[in-house]
């Protein structure tokens, strides 16, 4: 028989981790494996049909993607949809496929909302998801004794898929569920330096453990301004939520990785500022199969897709699509063996959930909700060399923090700063002697009203639903 896989991904724009130029070669490799293995879908031919999730402008579109999905559904009656990856594109498609009872498999759509499988029935996420980032952060807070307060800052970039909005949403909700902790969150516009200054004044009043989702350049600018404002690593820690490790790549990402380095005359200050910085990324798979897969992936991308793939963590997404497709093939094979059909979406999906699988990305564990357990790495700076290196990994399956290579976290005072200052954020603790604080220090504490409309908090509704804000 014939089994049709309907692809809804960006076909022209190659910048997304789930662009077809990247995922296509991974799909080819997966289907070649299925064909070569007699135990997978014997007697079946798998074919792919392509549709774009992009608008005419070449960016992910919440209009184009569902229209494409509808066209593919009526023209080809696919057994499974592959993609979309972008959140705004995946949301309507996922609702349609749920209504059609057709499985949707993606290694994108990382937003918290897709975890609601009543709304997104039969959606399986073989890639990372942001709620899992919350699991890591919660484990880190528990281990470091930060159980009272955290602050999250995220960049708003007009006209894109709002990755930082969704990163923060997943982290925020999951950390609050896992820990009885106050998490404040502030949105800011990238490039608005005046706003950065206001932002850092609020930071002083709201947090000591701060998570920042932004571009590498913006993070560096914020760190420089923080240093200037006296927000040093002795009292503050700034985690850059840089999941694909962009700050650790490029010219400043070559080994040794120095994300603070730009050769712009500010490197000395940036080096000092980054004593307070740590970077959170996805974990690079370290199994030999992954390296071999990358070699084949790059070759195929160049030969058949006329695309040159760079090194980096973005390649974990095509790899996750590859593993997801093999897992799907396994589930269909088992469903057929038990008397089911390729259109039996519920049965196939249930066989993909709550199971482990050895893929090119290593040990892959799908949770009972159809979302992959995600591993993360925490990078920190060696105070001697200024180079960032992985100090610990988070194993999503075991929920354990796993330390690496004898490295230790770099704390300027020899221990992590408390998440709430000894005397409280506004020196409100009566046990503290008010005389110890200078008038200058008090002047630095800006009231929230001073920020006025600049400060934009995420509402719970925003975090649960996918709409532009």
């Amino acid at each position: 028989g014939n089994l049709t896989v309907a692809v809804v991904l960006p076909l022209a724009n190659t910048s997304y981790p789930w662009s077809w130029a990247r995922v296509g070669p991974a799909v080819e490799l997966a289907l070649a494996k299925v064909k070569a293995r007699p135990d997978l879908l014997p007697g079946w031919t798998v074919r792919t049909v392509l549709g774009s999730s992009e608008s005419a402008l070449g960016v992910c579109s919440d209009t184009a993607a569902p229209l494409t999905a509808v066209d593919l559904k009526w023209e080809h009656n696919p057994a499974v949809f592959l993609g979309p990856g972008c959140v705004y594109a995946a949301a309507p498609v996922g609702r349609f496929t749920a209504h059609w009872r057709v499985p949707l498999l993606t290694a994108g759509a990382p937003a918290l909302g897709f975890g609601a499988k009543d709304e997104y029935a039969l959606t399986t996420r073989a890639g990372p998801s942001h709620a899992k980032l919350g699991d890591f952060v919660a484990a880190l807070h528990r281990r470091l004794g930060w159980e009272r307060q955290a602050l999250v800052l995220y960049a708003y970039q007009p006209g894109d898929d709002q990755p930082c909005f969704f990163v923060v949403g997943g982290l925020y909700m999951r950390v609050r569920d896992r820990l009885n902790i106050t998490v404040d969150h502030l949105e800011f516009a990238e490039g608005d330096r005046d706003h950065y200054t206001l932002l850092l004044r609020t930071v002083r009043r709201k947090g000591r453990v701060i998570y920042i989702c932004s571009s590498p350049d913006t993070f560096r600018t914020l760190m420089l301004l923080a240093l200037e404002a006296g927000l040093s690593g002795e009292d503050y820690v700034f985690f850059h939520l840089d999941l694909f490790g962009h700050s650790l790549q490029g010219a400043h990402g070559l080994v040794p990785r120095r994300p603070w380095e730009r050769e712009d005359g500010q490197d000395v200050s940036a080096h000092q500022a980054f004593q307070a910085a740590k970077i959170i990324t996805y974990k690079e798979p370290d199994n030999p199969e992954y390296l071999e897969f990358l070699r084949k992936l790059k070759h195929l991308a160049r030969e058949q897709f006329n695309f040159t793939m760079e090194d980096g963590l973005v390649n974990t997404i095509p790899a996750a699509f590859h593993d997801g497709l093999l897992l799907y093939a396994q589930a269909v094979t088992e469903t057929l063996a038990h008397g089911g059909t390729v259109t039996d979406g519920e049965s196939i999906t249930q066989r993909m959930w709550n199971r482990s699988f050895q893929g090119v990305t290593g040990y892959l564990k799908m949770d009972s909700n159809g979302d992959r357990e995600t591993d993360f790495s925490l990078w920190d700076m060696d105070p001697e060399t200024g180079a960032f290196r992985v100090v610990l990994n988070f194993n999503g399956t075991s929920q354990e923090l796993v330390t690496v290579s004898g490295h230790t976290l770099n704390w300027p005072l020899g221990h992590p700063p408390p998440d709430v200052p000894r005397c409280g954020f506004d020196n409100e603790d009566p046990a503290c002697n008010q005389d110890h604080f200078s008038t200058l220090e008090e002047q630095k504490l800006i009231s929230e009203e001073d920020l006025g409309g600049e400060q934009k908090l995420i509402s719970e509704e925003d975090l649960h639903h996918h709409h532009h804000h």
């Epitope: 001697e384 610990l392 020899g414």
Partner: antibody
């Protein structure tokens, strides 16, 4: 509660090797490092080396380089310290101790010690 | 390797006395220093980490100070159970190194 339990006392001849074990319990084994410390009778503490249980990474003090090997077994949460080419000066109490690389609290829990006597 | 020089090597004091032990590093080690107490036949016990942070369960009469190269352990009012040997340890980088110890005896 956190515990590091070491193997029993050993008597060895010069030139022989000794393997001392340290079994960890009460915490996540792969989240902390294990260090070994030697103390000769009436002498001070001497750091021997470290092992990272998650990946087996080791770093040894110059004094012990070439003679010491630290290994781990994650299935039993046990770390081993193997010291070869023993001489009488190696007669000492050997301790394992835990180090938290996240909070960077050094050697907060210690084993009870293993006395190794090297004598002909 | 970083050398740790502890002084004095021995010290006699009486119950109730205030006692200070110092440790000097051969190079800057920021705040990465711990203090340990060891009694005969027992394993060492961590008193202070990160130069001045009291380990949980340790009496508040013990305090640590210093940064960079010079560090101090102070016992504000000696108790009978405090007579022991004290060691400093630098955990700034590998190899970790201990001071040679200070034996605190009853006068």
């Amino acid at each position: 509660q956190v515990q590091l339990v070491q193997s029993g006392a050993e008597v060895k001849k010069p030139g022989a090797s000794v393997k001392v074990s340290c079994k960890a319990s009460g915490y996540t084994f792969t989240s902390y490092y294990i260090h070994w410390v030697r103390q000769a009778p009436g002498q001070g503490l001497e750091w021997m080396g470290i092992i990272s249980p998650s990946d087996g990474y080791t770093s040894y003090a110059q004094n012990f380089q070439g003679r010491v090997t630290m290994t781990r077994d994650t299935s039993t949460n046990t770390v081993y310290m193997d010291l070869s080419s023993l001489r009488s000066e190696d007669t000492a109490m050997f301790y394992c101790a835990r180090n938290d690389p996240l909070t960077t609290v050094a050697l907060d829990y210690w084993g009870q010690g293993t006395l190794v006597t090297v004598s002909s | 390797a970083i050398q740790m020089t502890q002084s004095p090597s021995s010290l006699s004091a009486s119950v109730g006395d205030r006692v200070t032990i110092t440790c000097r590093a051969s190079q800057g080690i920021r705040y990465d220093l711990g203090w340990f107490q060891q009694k005969p036949g027992k394993a060492p016990k961590l008193l202070i980490h990160a130069a001045s942070s009291l380990q949980s369960g340790v009496p508040s009469r013990f305090s640590g100070s210093g940064s960079g190269t010079d560090f101090t352990l102070t016992i504000s009012s000696l108790q009978p159970e405090d007579f022991a040997t004290y060691y400093c340890l630098q955990d700034y980088n590998y190899p970790f190194t201990f001071g040679q110890g200070t034996k605190l005896e009853i006068k």
